[in-house]
């Protein structure tokens, strides 16, 4: 006998075909001796089964003594032993329906769990093996599970069901919701224009939420909401927002936050959240702030950060085209007495500068002894 | 002999709507599925609906879902082809085809075409 | 939907000679392929149905052959009735497809 596996939904094709390469008579039944379709002359004819309004057939093959069943939109139930009758014999094809579905939403927060379930027909014991779009497998027999997804897992995933030494592969677009970075660093000189940007890792037709955005200042003993906003259908709007700093915020995706200015008090780190409707659980997305200060009082040079800083990062104070006069590990760093000329304040890591502040330093003029 | 006779063609502006009619001779109409094809300017085919012998099953391609409706009047031996929200990109030859048989077989017979053009 | 890559989109060839016809489906489409003659101010003529059957009182100069995502169609004996546009058609599925069209031109 015959093995045919089809999928939930799908179309399937039977085959029967006589030794005659001419129209004959033939007829399609189940299991139950149901007429499901055969032929009078050149036309269909259809029995009372339940395939009914879902059965067919290919009319311009019978004169190729090919007399093929179509079964469109599959149900698990259609699974069954099909008997074609074509010349005094009968071909029995056994169909075996499958249906794979993920029991939640296929649109699921970084971090949650997916499961995978497979729907089959009494009497089988088909395996399955997933394939996730980063390439990581997957076995299991009736559900499959993946906890905690990550970015990487959204897309295509290709499920193979196997029974019988045949198989079936079903792919299930998978969308893991998160922001592109799950952290941010912005460095900044004191004064400039802060840009905090927010790209989302997906895309869908509405997106509709909400969020805020919560600060720990490095110099603040607590953190602060600085800004609380809505998303309906990808449209930004601003519902509540502090007076200092002022915040603005931007009305479409991606998320986009400015800072008027870098000021050494805002420096730190912040958390975005964002709640999105008819899911449980919530995106985030850490954001930190840098900012550098260099100055001159009296015959001190001074640069200074503030922010979250990696303790391999270098501070150095530099005249323009010389070699550092200092440089450390540190947050400031200063000079006594500094040369005449442009001096320049470096944060960088490994060699790369990350942020630069230039100060010029201008010639101290000795007042002469009078005799 | 298998004859398709259409009818119906028309320049129509944007957004406009239009009738399209087959007529069938030949042939015992009801016992076939049929279809309409056009063909573009840029002398490409394509299907654009299909109905099955008893008016069971209507398929379309996206590009004219919602917009186009396709029937069949058995008793008068004529297919229709009802086109609404009409797009300059719907400028075309429509042919009337008839099926092989059934909704899955391939057109073996077609009308002389009909033109329609969707223009300001 | 499937696609259908139908190559050359034109060519030339001499009278008595052989031309021969490219379709290329994005995906498996079972030997469901037809192939049709179109002459201008005419409906389309099927000329090969399920890869390779000749419809009746189709000339057996025109052939046609392949399988799963390839398909090839063949005049040879070319003669000058043969100048129109030739076109494959997947039906697989119930969404048809055409190729682009290849117009037969004589040297």
């Known amino acids: 006998k015959k093995v045919v596996l089809g999928k939930k939904g799908d179309t399937v094709e039977l085959t029967c075909t006589a030794s005659q390469k001419k129209s004959i008579q033939f007829h399609w039944k189940n299991s139950n001796q149901i007429k499901i379709l055969g032929n009078q002359g050149s036309f269909l004819t259809k029995g009372p089964s339940k395939l009914n309004d879902r059965a067919d057939s290919r009319r311009s093959l019978w004169d190729q003594g090919n007399f093929p069943l179509i079964i469109k939109n599959l149900k698990i139930e259609d699974s069954d032993t099909y008997i074609c009758e074509v010349e005094d014999q009968k071909e029995e094809v056994q169909l075996l329906v499958f249906g794979l579905t993920a029991n939640s939403d296929t649109h699921l927060l970084q971090g949650q769990s997916l499961t995978l379930t497979l729907e089959s027909p009494p009497g089988s014991s088909p395996s399955v093996q997933c394939r996730s779009p980063r390439g990581k497998n997957i076995q299991g027999g009736k559900t499959l599970s993946v906890s905690q997804l990550e970015l990487q897992d959204s897309g295509t995933w290709t499920c193979t069901v196997l029974q019988n030494q045949k198989k079936v592969e079903f792919k299930i677009d998978i969308v893991v919701l998160a922001f592109q970075k799950a952290s941010s660093i912005v460095y900044k000189k004191e004064g400039e224009q802060v840009e905090f940007s927010f790209p989302l890792a997906f895309t869908v037709e509405k997106l509709t939420g909400s969020g805020e955005l919560w600060w720990q200042a490095e110099r603040a003993s607590s953190s602060k909401s600085w800004i609380t906003f809505d998303l309906k259908n990808k449209e930004v709007s601003v519902k509540r927002v502090t007076q200092d700093p002022k915040l603005q915020m931007g009305k479409k995706l991606p998320l986009h936050l400015t800072l008027p200015q870098a000021l050494p008090q805002y420096a730190g780190s912040g958390n975005l959240t964002l709640a999105l409707e008819a899911k449980t659980g919530k995106l985030h997305q850490e954001v930190n702030l840098v900012v550098m200060r260099a100055t001159q009082l009296q015959k001190n040079l001074t640069c200074e950060v503030w922010g979250p800083t990696s303790p391999k990062l270098m501070l150095s104070l530099k005249l323009e085209n010389k070699e550092a006069k200092v440089s450390k590990r540190e947050k400031a760093v200063w000079v006594l007495n500094p040369e005449a000329g442009m001096w320049q304040c470096l944060l960088s890591d490994s060699g790369q500068v990350l942020l630069e502040s230039n100060i010029k330093v201008l010639p101290t003029w000795s007042t002469p002894v009078q005799p | 002999e298998v004859i398709l006779v259409q009818s119906g063609g028309a320049l129509v502006e944007p957004g406009g709507s239009l009738k399209l009619s087959c007529s069938a001779s030949g042939f015992t109409f009801s016992n076939y599925a049929m279809s309409w094809v056009r063909q573009t300017p840029e002398k490409r085919l394509e299907w654009v609906a299909a109905i099955s012998d008893h008016s069971t099953n209507t398929y379309y391609p996206d590009s004219v879902k919602g917009r186009f409706t396709i029937s069949r009047d058995n008793a008068k031996n004529t297919l229709y082809l009802q086109m609404n929200s009409l797009r300059s990109e719907d400028t075309a030859i429509y042919y009337c085809?008839?099926?092989?048989?059934?909704?899955?077989?391939?057109?073996?017979?077609w009308g002389q075409g009909t033109t329609l053009t969707v223009s300001s | 939907d499937i696609q259908m890559t139908q190559s050359p989109s034109s060519l030339s060839a001499s009278l008595g000679g052989k031309v021969t016809i490219a379709c290329k489906a994005s995906q498996d489409i079972n030997n469901y392929i037809a192939w049709y003659q179109h002459k201008p101010g005419k409906g389309p003529r099927l000329l090969i149905h399920y890869t390779s059957t000749l419809q009746p009182g189709i000339p057996s100069r025109f052939s046609g052959s392949g399988s799963g995502r390839d398909y090839s169609f063949s005049i040879s004996n070319l003669e000058p009735e043969d100048i129109a546009t030739y076109y494959c058609?997947?039906?697989?599925?119930?969404?048809?497809?055409f190729g682009g069209g290849t117009k037969l031109e004589i040297k």
């Open positions: 085809a008839r099926k092989y048989g059934g909704d899955y077989d391939p057109f073996d017979y």
């Open positions: 058609l997947q039906y697989d599925n119930l969404l048809f497809t």
